[in-house]
């Protein structure tokens, strides 16, 4: 189901990444320098910014982030 409208619930933040709010609804996600070999799987649809620098991601499949607008 969809997550309830709330100002007190933390939106999904991928494990080990750092997240902070970007306005009322959106989330900035920093997954840099984590040794990742693939994209984090549980990205919030409310992600406005994603930093994947300094990782080991060698290739991306077509449409790698279908949940993001």
């Amino acid at each position: 189901g969809s997550s309830p409208r709330s100002g007190v619930l933390l939106r999904g933040c991928p494990t080990h990444c750092h997240c902070e709010p970007d306005g009322r609804m959106l989330l900035r996600v920093d997954c840099s320098d984590l040794g990742l070999s693939e994209l984090p799987s549980n990205l919030s649809v409310f992600t406005s910014y994603l930093d994947l620098s300094m990782n080991n991601i060698s290739q991306l499949l077509p449409n790698p982030l279908p949940s993001l607008r």
Epitope: P4, S6, G7, L10, P21
Partner: antibody, heavy 117, light 107 residues
């Protein structure tokens, strides 16, 4: 700087109602939710509910439905919580706090409510 | 409702000590955990969000870790100003719930 001003104390008789206030300043009032939290003497923190000042949409802890009513006055950047049918169990410190996407980043100083005849 | 348990209600430590405060959730909260500090005068401050994100202005001696149901707050080098009560809070589901608090005292 961000400030949430709450009265220091309120003394109310059992059975009566009280309306606690929380005046916000230093930020855009309608851009952040307002949370209300209860703390009994020597106890932990208990979430009462929250309100979005932009349209007064609110969520309540089931435990406080019928006890607490949250409202806002955007013209004065003030959030209110009315507590009804007061008993000694309602004697506590009540905090307001602003939040955005889960970050409850600024808290008021709290209002000490005493329910006594 | 998700129950948050801080098994240690009070903790005595010496200045300069490394102190760890633990918090357990009754179910997986997916790292959606905040830590708050409440000073003796009642002032409440957010220290850490999302399990490990240090808030702006919070000293780097504070750190958060954990996953699933078990989380902890560590103060690496205890200072006088850290004497307070620390609460964990889950932000995974409504209603958000808090741990009972751990009161930190100087030995």
């Amino acid at each position: 700087q961000v400030q949430l001003q709450q009265p220091g104390a309120e003394l109310v008789k059992p059975g009566a109602s009280v309306k606690l206030s929380c005046k916000a300043s230093g930020y855009t009032f309608t851009s952040y939710w307002m949370q209300w939290v209860k703390q009994r003497p020597g106890q932990g923190l208990e979430w009462i509910g929250e309100i979005d000042p932009s349209d007064s949409y609110s969520n309540y802890n089931q435990k406080f439905k019928g006890k607490a009513t949250l409202t806002v006055d955007t013209s004065s950047s003030t959030a209110y919580m009315q507590l009804s049918s007061l008993t000694s169990e309602d004697s506590a410190v009540y905090y307001c706090a602003r939040s955005l996407s889960g970050y409850v980043d600024y808290w008021g100083q709290g209002t000490t409510l005493t329910v006594s005849s | 409702d998700i129950q948050m348990t801080q098994t240690t209600s009070s903790l005595s430590a010496s200045l300069g000590d490394r102190v760890t405060i633990s918090c357990r959730a009754s179910q997986d909260i997916s790292n959606r955990l905040n830590w708050y500090q409440q000073k003796p005068d009642g002032t409440v401050k957010l220290l850490i969000s999302y399990r490990s994100r240090l808030q702006s202005g919070v000293p780097s001696r504070f750190s958060g870790s954990g996953s699933g149901t078990d989380y902890s707050l560590t103060i690496s080098n205890l200072e006088e100003e850290d004497i307070a009560t620390y609460f964990c809070q889950q932000g995974n589901t409504l209603p958000p719930t808090f741990g009972g608090g751990t009161k930190l005292e100087v030995r």
